[in-house]
């Protein structure tokens, strides 16, 4: 293990994992979830691991698959995260902030359709505010930069420098409330092109721009069926 | 396991169109784009264009007035058709799978153009 | 269009030498991904996402850079390395290629 940083070579003794990808180099590499330790030896944070998408290694942040869990919920809920690992969930802004805090991440973003097609973008760059004193206080800003099609279209660059919404925490650029508006939680600007965390409402729907929509892929009037989004260190 | 078989018309004449299948197996067309890419002979690589695993097409812009790129995902084959050839349009055509970048590819179909 | 301009065009190495082909790019792109093709045969994806193994490639092989700049490097050569190499950026479309270089073993 020469070579390897301070902070890291103590996690890796201690089998105190940051992320997926320290996870993946003590020899774990099925799918599954995992505890990792964003915020220090004492708190454990269950995740799920891809370990298989292109190359896995792949902290998930965001699954959502059939809609038994809703995503349309408080600050505090998704400051803190809510779910579980092995199912619907969602990290938490916190933890997300301290991951990338500590490496820089690439993002990948996985859809899929009620027609069983599968569709992916991916983000070289992905931060939740960097150089806050306070991220929760900065809003848990969103940067993503450096987009790669892979079917999907761009829909997640219009939010980036935006800070994160809730219904009972309105941060967004819109005169009214986007994420009441488009039942919903995130990086709003006004209000959105991707939705995910938006209601689960299981292929087209009437409503306008409420569902887990992708604009640049299903537009505004489909919700997806599958949604995760995941980073890994860059 | 991932393969993608290419068939086509070795000769074609100058001004006539082009049209090449590209069927795979070991992968759902649902789950996975397919790009084209050709090869002059001696020269290097140039991108085509790529269907989408929904049926949305991306193409190159200098070819895309006589390019068309479809598919059946149920028959798992996936089709290009080119019109309006030229001789410099004789190349070696390869159909390739995407995810991660351009994982897998065709073995390549040898297009000559020539009266 | 991004243009990719790599260099050298053509090298020839000792086997045993490390050998650097870079890749520059007329804009800023994402990612880098390179190829490898040896004569008769199909591409095969080498490096994906700039520094990424594809499924068998030698560790000897490893990929790096960023916005305009990046390179494939080869840390001590071999026999079955001589092939062409070659860039492609799918930041925006259309995609493109680099030219290509051509390593030949000595």
């Known amino acids: 293990v020469s070579g390897i940083r301070g902070d890291a070579l103590e996690r890796f003794c201690l089998q105190q994992p940051l992320d997926c990808d320290d996870i993946y180099a003590q020899g774990y590499q099925s799918d599954g979830v995992y505890l990792i330790y964003p915020s220090g030896p004492s708190v454990p944070v269950p995740v799920f691991c891809d370990m298989t998408t292109e190359g896995g290694k792949w902290t998930v942040f965001q699954k959502r698959f059939n809609g038994s869990v809703s995503f349309f919920r408080g600050w505090n809920d998704y400051k803190l995260g809510f779910g579980r690992a092995d199912g619907e969930y969602w990290l938490g802004l916190q933890n997300m902030h301290l991951l990338t805090l500590k490496q820089k991440y690439e993002l990948r973003v996985d859809l899929e359709d009620f027609e069983n097609n599968t569709a992916y973008a991916k983000y070289a760059d992905f931060s939740i505010s960097p150089n806050a004193v306070s991220a929760e206080e900065d809003g848990y800003t969103l940067f993503v930069a450096g987009f790669e099609d892979g079917g999907a279209g761009d829909s997640l660059s219009y939010h980036s420098g935006q800070k994160f919404s809730t219904f009972d925490r309105d941060q967004d650029l819109f005169v009214q409330n986007c994420a009441a508006l488009s039942s919903g939680a995130f990086w709003f600007r006004s209000c959105h092109f991707a939705n995910l965390n938006g209601f689960y409402l299981g292929g087209s729907h009437l409503s306008y721009a409420n569902g887990i929509n992708w604009a640049q892929w299903k537009g505004f009037y489909y919700s997806l069926k599958r949604t995760e989004m995941k980073i890994r260190r860059a | 396991q991932v393969q993608l078989e290419q068939s086509g018309p070795g000769l074609v004449a100058p001004s006539q169109s082009l049209s090449i299948t590209c069927t795979v197996s070991?992968?759902?067309?649902?789950?996975?784009?397919v790009h084209w890419v050709r090869q002059p002979p001696g020269k290097g690589l140039e991108w085509l264009g790529v269907?989408?695993?929904?049926?949305?097409?991306n193409y190159n812009s200098a070819l895309m007035s006589r390019l068309s790129i479809s598919k059946d995902n149920s028959k798992t084959q996936v089709f290009l058709k080119m019109n309006s050839l030229q001789t410099d349009d004789t190349a070696m055509y390869y159909c390739?799978?995407?995810?991660?970048?351009?994982?897998?590819w065709g073995q390549g179909t040898s297009v000559t153009v020539s009266s | 269009d991004i243009v990719l301009t790599q260099t050298p065009a053509i090298m020839s190495v000792s086997p045993g030498e490390k050998v650097t082909i870079t890749c520059s790019a007329s804009?800023?792109?994402?990612?880098m991904h390179w190829f490898q093709q040896k004569p008769g045969t199909s591409p095969k994806l080498w490096i994906y996402?700039?520094?990424n193994l594809a499924s068998g490639v030698p560790a000897r092989f490893s990929g790096s850079g960023s916005g305009t700049s990046y390179s494939l490097t080869i840390s001590r050569t071999e026999a079955e390395d001589a092939a062409t190499y070659y860039c492609?950026?799918?930041?925006?479309?259309?995609?493109?290629f680099g030219g290509g270089t051509k390593l030949e073993i000595k």
């Open positions: 804009s800023s792109v994402s990612y």
């Open positions: 996402s700039t520094s």
């Open positions: 492609q950026q799918r930041s925006s479309y259309p995609y493109t």
């Open positions: 390739a799978r995407d995810d991660p970048s351009m994982a897998y």
């Open positions: 269907i989408w695993t929904a049926g949305n097409t």
């Open positions: 070991g992968f759902s067309l649902t789950r996975y784009g």
